[in-house]
């Protein structure tokens, strides 16, 4: 079945509410050690606000003040650096806003782009120069929050150097991250100093810490992973399909309907028909005839196309592709116009015998 990304969901289903996850790079608040910092939770209609730092609940203390939608940190220290989040709980939903706090004397900046040049992952090691681990490419580590749609692949990188070559191990929520902790395990790519998790699921949410160490020292860096679950929806039908068609009597025609659905859809082709000269019954509902439906021996590809061979004037009219799943129903319609064949008398249109 064709699949689609979050972006396509939004464009194809504009009536759906946008996913309430912050996908972009979080805002960064910078403070020098000793300074005070005040951040306002940028969420509307926040009834109840809760705060976290690096995924752990944040409560007030002698330096941290939480008043309404404001977070105040007095006398900031480098330990206050990290990924913060405020969550607004409402009656129907909740929304989270992430931001970074960076308490440091020297501020670095950069983008988390895909690998184009690997040169910066290594710094030359003088063979006699023993050295504790250090980061070789902090730009690749700046994006701490990764909000990723479910089923995507996540790659966390901690490019490092040191002599002797450091070891890299990974923790999830502060504990050793073992292969058996997730279905499908994960991969480490030593030459990229990376952790790769394929086909992420909601249970993968959490904090991932790389610990890079050799006999001369240890450094670590934490990423936060949020897995954005795709909101369930009724089937999506490709715009413009089926398309209006016209043919001459005796000709052939086909209507195509492209259906996108996460949940297994049921597809039907329906023709609008007349009964006793009327298109609608006493209840105001149209008279319909099911022409084709998915059966045990019908493939998805077969059901997406409706063929009408040796067309007659009776075949003219409105055709509907209807797709339903456990969430709802979608349909698109098209018209078939039947033209007289050259040099042939016009046929008389008869009412259909079989109505449904």
């Amino acid at each position: 079945r064709p699949s689609f990304s979050l972006v396509e969901d939004t464009t194809l289903e504009p009536e759906e509410p946008p996913t309430k996850y912050q996908i972009s790079q979080p805002e960064v608040y910078v403070a020098a050690p000793g300074e005070s910092l005040e951040v306002r939770c940028l969420l509307k209609d926040a009834a109840v606000i809760s705060w976290t730092k690096d995924g752990v609940h944040l409560g007030p203390n002698n330096r941290t003040v939480l008043i309404g939608e404001y977070l105040q940190i007095k006398g900031a220290t480098p330990r206050d650096s990290g990924l913060y989040a405020c969550t607004a709980s409402r009656t129907v939903d909740s929304e989270t806003w992430y931001f970074m706090v960076n308490v440091t004397d020297a501020i670095s900046s950069g983008d988390d782009e895909d690998d184009t040049d690997g040169a910066e992952d290594f710094v030359s090691e003088n063979s006699n120069n023993k050295r504790a681990p250090y980061w070789t490419n902090t730009e690749k580590m700046e994006k701490r929050l990764h909000a990723v749609p479910a089923a995507n692949t996540v790659k966390f990188r901690c490019p490092a150097g040191g002599n002797p070559m450091p070891t890299m191990r990974w923790l999830k929520n502060g504990k050793e991250f073992k292969q058996e902790h997730r279905i499908g395990g994960y991969k480490v790519r030593n030459q990229h100093w990376s952790l790769i998790m394929e086909s992420v699921v909601p249970s993968d949410k959490g904090n991932y810490t790389c610990v890079v160490e050799n006999e001369y020292g240890s450094i670590n860096h934490t990423y936060h992973l949020d897995v954005v679950e795709r909101s369930p929806h009724r089937p999506i039908l490709q715009a413009g399909l089926p398309a209006n068609a016209s043919t001459v009597v005796g000709g052939d025609v086909e209507f195509v309907c492209k259906v996108y659905s996460d949940a297994q859809p049921h597809i039907q082709w329906i023709k609008h028909v007349e009964k006793n000269g009327s298109k609608y019954g006493p209840d105001g509902l149209p008279y319909l005839k099911v022409l084709k439906a998915a059966g045990v021996n019908t493939t998805d590809k077969e059901i997406e196309v409706l063929y009408i061979r040796n067309v007659t004037f009776e075949d003219a009219g409105e055709y509907t592709c209807l797709a339903g799943n456990s969430i709802g129903i979608s349909f698109h319609s098209a018209w078939l116009t039947v033209l007289p064949a050259p040099g042939r008398e016009k046929e008389i249109t008869a009412s259909p015998d079989y109505l449904e």
């Epitope: 040049d117 690997g118 040169a119 710094v123 991969k187 790519r189 030459q191 990229h192």
Partner: antibody, heavy 123, light 106 residues
């Protein structure tokens, strides 16, 4: 077809120097980390030295650190190992190997090997 | 340093046998493990990487498994041409080979 061909081996006296070379073809040499692996007669395999795909980083096993230098010339697709202050325990067949295409999903395993060249350190 | 221990050091088996070779790391190596085959007078050849991925061109009778510290190479049906010495190697935090398992025909 990937081909790695070592040269420069032979007999050398203890304390002297020798330089091994490896000519690579059939691959995008500048994408690959490269390594030297050795095998003493009737013994197991032993990693000697590694150099990253761009030459920016190199690592050595403890017993050769400070005596051996690994280098590469990406323009000529060649790998070198300069061996100084040679010892009798350096006697081995030396293999040139690739250690993963950086720009693929490969890791640091040794995917392609040369046939090897014998280095004998003896007086 | 992480040590790699292979067992047995010598294994005799018959054609058609299912053969299992073991490799143990002194600490977790995160599946960063390769298996190599070396025939007499030849260079080693990569068989398995990432603990369980079969290198292109290697017969499907070879398979790898394991995680953490314990890894296994299995030959499902031994062929005469499989007579060789097999080495495991970790490439997590540097490179270390196991001592090797010599496989011979009964």
């Amino acid at each position: 077809e990937v081909q790695l061909v070592e040269s420069g081996g032979g007999l050398v006296q203890p304390g002297r120097s020798m330089k091994l070379s490896c000519a690579a073809s059939g691959l995008t040499f500048s994408n690959y980390g490269m390594a030297w692996v050795r095998q003493a007669p009737k013994k197991g395999l032993e990693w000697v030295a590694f150099i990253s795909h761009d030459g920016g980083s190199s690592y050595y096993r403890d017993s050769v650190e400070g005596r051996f230098i690994i280098s590469r010339d990406n323009a000529k697709s060649t790998l070198s190992l300069q061996m100084d202050s040679l010892r009798s325990e350096d006697t081995a067949t030396y293999y040139c190997t690739t250690a993963g295409d950086y720009y693929s999903d490969n890791d640091w395993y040794f995917d392609f090997w040369g046939p090897g060249i014998m280095v004998t350190v003896s007086s | 340093d992480i040590q790699m221990t292979q067992s047995p050091s010598l294994l005799s088996a018959s054609v058609g046998d299912r053969v299992t070779l073991s490799c143990k790391a002194s600490q977790s190596i995160y599946n960063s493990l390769a298996w190599y085959q070396q025939k007499l007078g030849e260079a080693p050849k990569l068989l398995i990487y990432d603990a369980d991925s079969l290198q292109t061109g290697i017969p499907s009778r070879f398979s790898g498994s394991g995680s953490g510290t314990d890894y296994t190479l299995t030959i499902s049906s031994l062929q005469p041409e499989d007579v060789a010495t097999y080495f495991c190697q970790k490439y997590y935090s540097g490179w270390t080979f196991g001592g090797g398992t010599k496989l011979e025909l009964k």
